[in-house]
């Protein structure tokens, strides 16, 4: 014969536990129904009647099957440095996460953030060694020789100095190298002013085909970033 299915409330067999979504009521000494997420126990069970559940009120919630007498209060509204990524409903608490450019320095058990902090910025001469995450700050490092950063940023890494045919001003940790611009002498009339052109810039070049057998003329480019290095630094 198939085993008889017990309906709540029921007295459990000695040494056995209640089934899934049931709890043991010490007062009634019976296995009783839990309330579903979004509800709470309005009336506890007795030997003859099961748990009476009721919906959570506004701004309260229960996330799990439960037999709590009152729903939990949703957390306070998100602060100005936070974004509400999950609204308060009858079944889940509000979740506040940090805005872009911020990270969570102190979080709650529910995954919400209690305290957001602005991501650190790496200044000129420093680049990002480890990017910031939702829960950790940016780590900066000094730019190694041959690399530079001329920005104050929470995302920029140290970049290599540009390669120059001829260096006008050597690069340092906070400034790219400044190159002299070279072009074939026969591409201009004698005495013509040669406008400086950045080396390997992101603009389109339309200089004529190289004439490497002729000596190039040179003109200097002014540094675009911070002031040039102190006296004593030499170019090519």
């Amino acid at each position: 014969l198939p085993a008889q299915v017990a309906f709540t409330p029921y007295a459990p067999e000695p040494g056995s536990t209640c089934r899934l979504r049931e709890y043991y009521d010490q007062t009634a000494q019976m296995c009783c129904s839990k309330c579903s997420p979004g509800q709470h126990a309005k009336v506890f069970c007795t030997k003859t009647s099961d748990t009476v559940c009721d919906s959570c009120e506004d701004s309260t919630y229960t996330q799990l099957w439960n037999w709590v007498p009152e729903c939990l209060s949703c957390g306070s509204r998100c602060s100005s440095d936070q974004v509400e990524t999950q609204a308060c409903t009858r079944e889940q608490n509000r979740i506040c996460t940090c805005r872009p450019g911020w990270y969570c320095a102190l979080s709650t058990h529910s995954g919400s953030c209690r305290q957001c902090m602005r991501l650190s910025k790496c200044g000129p001469g420093f680049g990002v060694a480890r990017p910031g995450t939702e829960t950790s700050d940016v780590v900066c490092k000094p730019c190694a020789p041959g690399t530079f950063s001329n920005t104050t940023s929470s995302t920029d890494i140290c970049r290599p100095h540009q390669i120059c045919n001829v260096v006008a001003i050597p690069g340092n940790a906070s400034m790219d190298a400044v190159c002299t611009s070279t072009s074939p002498t026969r591409s201009m009339a004698p005495g013509a002013v040669h406008l400086p052109q950045p080396v390997s810039t992101r603009s389109q070049h339309t200089q004529p085909t190289p004439e490497p057998s002729t000596a190039p003329s040179t003109s200097f480019l002014l540094p675009m970033g911070p002031s040039p290095p102190a006296e004593g630094s030499t170019g090519d």
Epitope: P170, V199, S200, R202, H205, P212, D236
Partner: antibody
């Protein structure tokens, strides 16, 4: 006519050293960045190192940094690559190349190449 | 793996037009840096074919042309000839690396 002629390649054991040379002619050597580019057997091109025209600034690929040293002698129109602590993966044909006019990130002239074999 | 991506092979018959692509990223081609193309005939050193996206050095036939858009570039060869059978490499500057970066190369075969 621009000419670049490499020499100094050969067979060397792992951990050994080799010095490559590149003799240049036909252009104002000191006005241009010079590069070394390598090509492993049956593989593609890989930039290795560069040096500015006046030899004040050097540049290296991460794969050779600390092991290779690029230099030049403008009075002799010669480019060098000193290769130390050589590894099997350094086996390649090494080309010297001249930086382009106004933009040293392209190479308008290449040498014929010299083969470096690192093997025990 | 190369920083710039090229198809490993391409083919065409004499007289045809063939295009070879070169795809980069926001730190190289997409950053606005110029793309250069090299031709390497079997057993020889590479030779500059196209510089600064679309410029031809003297001596390079006008059958070869280059273009660039967004994060990619392409080399077009029209009126394909048997002597065009070679490896073709694209190259560009990259923000995060000291020197230029190359594509893996495309082996062009002229059929027939």
């Amino acid at each position: 006519e621009v000419q670049l002629l490499e020499s100094g390649g050969g067979l060397v054991q792992p951990g050994g050293s080799l010095r490559l040379s590149c003799a240049a002619s036909g252009f104002t050597f000191s006005s241009y960045a010079m590069h070394w580019v390598r090509q492993a057997p049956g593989k593609g091109l890989e930039w290795v190192s560069a040096i500015s025209g006046g030899a004040t600034t050097t540049y290296y690929a991460d794969s050779v940094k600390g092991r290779f040293t690029i230099s030049r002698d403008n009075s002799k129109n010669t480019l060098y690559l000193q290769m130390n602590s050589l590894r099997a993966e350094d086996t390649a044909v090494y080309y010297c190349a001249k930086g382009g006019t106004g933009d040293p990130y392209y190479f308008d002239y290449w040498g014929q190449g010299t083969l470096v074999t690192v093997s025990s | 793996q190369s920083v710039l991506t090229q198809p490993p092979s391409a083919s065409g018959t004499p007289g045809q037009r063939v295009t070879i692509s070169c795809t980069g990223s926001s730190s190289n081609i997409g950053a606005g840096y110029d793309v250069h193309w090299y031709q390497q005939l079997p057993g020889t050193a590479p030779k500059l074919l196209i510089y600064r996206n679309n410029q031809r050095p003297s001596g390079v036939p006008d059958r070869f042309s280059g273009s660039k858009s967004g994060t990619s570039a392409s080399l077009a060869i029209s009126g394909l000839r048997s002597e065009d059978e070679a490896d073709y490499y694209c190259a560009a500057r990259d923000d995060g690396l000291s020197g230029p970066v190359f594509g893996g190369g495309t082996k062009l075969t002229v059929l027939g």
